[in-house]
Amino acid sequence: KETAFVEVVLFESSPSGDYTTYTTGLTGRFSRAGATLSAEGEIVQMHPLGLCNNNDEEDLYEYGWVGVVKLEQPELDPKPCLTVLGKAKRAVQRGATAVIFDVSENPEAIDQLNQGSEDPLKRPVVYVKGADAIKLMNIVNKQKVARARIQHRPPRQPTEYFDM
């Protein structure tokens, strides 16, 4: 299970139209459910239940975004519509180039994601927890425009792709 180095860049603007970017670095782990690859894209926060239904939103997404899913405590969803791996697959089917799971409240999901799959996804499936997950969700919950860049080695120039 390799370390995933994640950079999250938040696009902010002031009322006068000045724009600034804030870059936050955090680490997670590449799971065996997906590939150990670099990926980047706009962040889309996805509710676990939102990945259950096949709906008209399939056409909404362009290919190449990064899905962020905060998993709930298992007792809050005793009969999930999809396994964690199934949720990752659904996100990739909708055009995600990578999926990041916050497993802080559902650590059992780590084992599910790391069970050797005969058919792993061709895109990265990363999990974060603890302080790194808090950092990520603090940004995502602001519902501002943000991009994520996932690498399997430490970034040399943190803002290389996001120079404003």
């Epitope: 696009f11 902010e12 603007s13 009322p15 139209g17 724009y19 970017t21 980047e40 706009e42 962040i43 889309v44 909404l60 997404y61 362009e62 290919y63 190449g64 975004w65 501002k144 425009v145 860049r149 290389e160 792709y161 996001f162 120079d163 404003m164």
Partner: antibody, heavy 120, light 107 residues
Framework: EVQLVESGGGLVQPGRSLKVSCAAS????????MAWVRQAPKKGLEWVAT????????YYPDSVKGRFTISRDNAKSTLYLQMDSLRSEDTANYYC?????????????WGQGVMVTVSS | DIQMTQSPSFLSASVGDRVSINCKAS??????LNWYQQELGEAPKRLIY???NLQTGIPSRFSGSGSGTDYTLTISGLQPEDFATYFC?????????FGSGTKLEIK
């Protein structure tokens, strides 16, 4: 089918103001960021302004910052560009553009444009 | 600001030809480059987004490639309706900037 129809262009004197509009249909307007892009006669394209889906964030290049204001009315599915202190170099065809989802920087559909001429 | 240098400015070709148009960024823009086609008096139409993703409804003869600072739009087997002006857009960050355009003409 996505449709973007601009209106409100015309001839205006330097230093005066003008507001152009863009009526959107064929998609859930409130879900998408929107933008204005302009093209001066015989010139290239220039990004003018972007607004996030809820309207809380706006972005402008230095060339129009402080003079132009992008806004939106999600209930009416309409995008606006208020242009103040107009200059002759603002003469251009102004295109309304829809941004792809997710994101605020990639334009996937454009309107036909509306001509704004700044001249005395 | 990121400058986009597009080449060539003019290109003459015949129906059936394979042609390439290039855009060079003044700095690394990751994958954030789109290609558009514009016919005279018409709205621009997106062909390719994020370097190599084909816009829905666009024929597969259009393809995009590149990374870092160098990007290419390739049209394999030109059709009569492809003679138009093409331009690139970098959307790595604000301010968003366009290439100067390539006018593709019938030889």
């Amino acid at each position: 089918e996505v449709q973007l129809v601009e209106s409100g262009g015309g001839l205006v004197q330097p230093g005066r103001s003008l507001k152009v509009s863009c009526a959107a249909s064929g998609f859930t307007f409130s879900t998408f960021a929107m933008a204005w892009v302009r093209q001066a006669p015989k010139k290239g394209l220039e990004w003018v302004a972007t607004i996030t889906p809820g309207g809380s964030n706006t972005y402008y290049p230095d060339s129009v910052k402080g003079r132009f204001t992008i806004s939106r009315d999600n209930a009416k599915s309409t995008l606006y560009l208020q242009m103040d202190s107009l200059r002759s170099e603002d003469t251009a065809n102004y295109y309304c553009a829809k941004c792809g989802y997710p994101g605020i920087t990639s334009f996937d559909y454009w309107g036909q444009g509306v001509m704004v001429t700044v001249s005395s | 600001d990121i400058q986009m240098t597009q080449s060539p400015s003019f290109l003459s070709a015949s129906v059936g030809d394979r042609v390439s148009i290039n855009c060079k960024a003044s700095q690394n823009i990751g994958k954030y480059l789109n290609w558009y086609q514009q016919e005279l008096g018409e709205a621009p139409k997106r062909l390719i987004y994020n370097t190599n993703n084909l816009q829905t409804g666009i024929p597969s003869r259009f393809s995009g490639s590149g990374s870092g600072t160098d990007y290419t739009l390739t049209i394999s087997g030109l059709q009569p309706e492809d003679f138009a002006t093409y331009f690139c857009l970098q959307h790595n960050g604000f301010p968003l900037t366009f290439g100067s355009g390539t006018k593709l003409e019938i030889k």
